[in-house]
């Protein structure tokens, strides 16, 4: 079998004139492409891998949101020679860019990386970026992740930065076919220059505060209960409560009203992400949909 | 939740123009991102014009370009596509479509909820 071959990490990597043509191994008897786009409010990019696949034949799309990241992801397997180039890559996945100007900035500021390589996108260097409200989302929290694309034995992968709805989500991630977007969120202006060690300690977890020993009393009607004022006694380490499989927690902070209507529940997905997927759990959604292959 | 619903499909000659509309009931029209999408018999649902809660992002098929154009009435709570210079191949089941982002979304899979869509005919 002989198969297109690239990969694209926010440039023209696989246009017509830098794709290769790779014969396969031996028993490999699908050609795959693979197209991830990543959107904040602040724009968009894409990855694209091409090359020899693994698995059956058939298509999968499935869109993601996590904390107002969108994320769209394309795998396509397919058996005959080179007929891995069918996906536009460079056509717009997810929305246009609006007029930014419209919108009034929130106060927030966060560095923005939205197709920019890992040199470019460290510490303080990446550009700044005013975060504004879109609809009744508000956008105060500022991101610093990753997405990874993995097809035909390839693993790509670019940081991600920007505006996100939650100011305190850590080392939180969706994933699709062969595909991964993850990191942390922060609370205040440019807080996103490295979130990589960022642990679980967050003002929604309440303190643990430690209580007087009761003193011994002979009248227990006259004793007035005083509890401590001293300083809260944080606990050493934390551990991430992981979300039910079965069941999807509900976002906390910012909610969009629409969103607490009776819904089908999804099943899976980390807390406070939507995993938009066409794989008939909203039949409703999109039209008729064809079926999974399990080759993707 | 919000209930859609189409109207203005019909039956017209080639080069003439249809006013399709939506009306929204429910909660917040206003703070959703909508949609035109359309389904020819055979072919996937492929987006048509999308616009943002405000209004202010408007994405447009490269197919209708010049030729439709999307607005809403947020006061209103509908959605307009106002189509010209129909062809032939803008035939289908138009749909009206919502999704919580806000945004001018260009992928189905982003949108939460759906009408039940309107025919347009384009034939002489």
């Known amino acids: 079998l002989e198969c297109y071959s690239c990969v694209q990490k926010a440039d023209d990597g696989c246009s017509p004139n830098k794709m290769k043509t790779v014969k396969c191994a031996p028993g490999v008897d699908v050609c795959t492409e693979a197209v991830g786009a990543v959107e904040t409010i602040h724009g968009q990019f894409s990855l694209a891998v091409r090359g020899c696949g693994s698995g059956l034949p058939g298509k999968n799309d499935r869109g993601l949101d996590l904390h107002g990241l969108l994320a769209f992801i394309q795998l396509q397997q397919c058996a005959q020679d080179r007929c891995n180039a069918k996906l536009n890559l460079t056509s717009r996945a997810l929305d246009p860019a609006g007029n930014e100007s419209a919108y009034p900035p929130n106060g927030v500021e966060c560095y923005s990386c939205v197709g920019l390589s890992r040199e470019a996108c460290q510490g303080t260097s990446p550009p700044v970026v005013s975060c504004y409200n879109a609809s009744d989302h508000v956008y105060k929290g500022c991101f610093d992740g990753n997405v990874t694309l993995t097809a035909a034995n390839v693993t790509v992968s670019l940081p991600v930065r920007g505006c996100v709805q939650d100011e305190f989500c850590t080392r939180d991630g969706v994933t699709g076919p062969g595909f991964t977007l993850s990191g942390s969120c922060c609370q205040g202006s440019r807080c996103n220059s490295d979130l990589r060690n960022k642990t679980y300690f967050s003002p929604r977890i309440p303190p643990l505060v430690r209580l007087p020993p009761p003193e011994p009393t002979t009248v227990a009607s006259t004793t007035s209960v005083t509890t401590s004022t001293s300083a809260p006694v944080r606990p050493t380490s934390t551990t991430k409560p992981m979300p039910a499989p079965t069941s999807q927690t509900p976002r906390q902070g910012v909610e969009h009203e629409a969103s607490r209507d009776e819904e089908p529940r999804l099943t899976g997905g980390a807390a406070g992400h939507q995993d938009r997927s066409n794989s008939g759990q909203y039949p409703a959604k999109g039209g008729p949909q064809q079926p999974h292959n399990k080759g993707c | 939740q919000v209930q859609l619903v189409e109207s203005g499909g019909g039956l017209v000659q080639p080069g003439g123009s249809l006013r399709l509309s939506c009306a929204a009931s429910?909660?917040?029209?206003?703070?959703?991102?909508m949609g035109w999408f359309r389904q020819a018999p055979g072919k996937e649902r492929e987006i048509v014009a999308a616009?943002?809660?405000?209004?202010?992002?408007?994405y447009y098929a490269n197919s209708v370009k010049g030729r439709f154009t999307i607005s809403r009435d947020n006061s209103k709570n509908t959605l307009y596509l106002q189509m010209n210079s129909l062809r032939a191949e803008d035939t289908a089941v138009y749909y009206c479509?919502?999704?919580?982002?806000?945004?001018?979304?260009?992928?189905?899979?982003?949108?939460?909820?759906w009408g039940q869509g309107t025919l347009v005919t384009v034939s002489s």
């Open positions: 479509a919502a999704n919580r982002q806000g945004r001018a979304l260009v992928r189905k899979e982003f949108y939460d909820y």
């Open positions: 429910g909660r917040s029209f206003s703070s959703y991102g």
């Open positions: 616009i943002s809660w405000g209004g202010s992002a408007v």
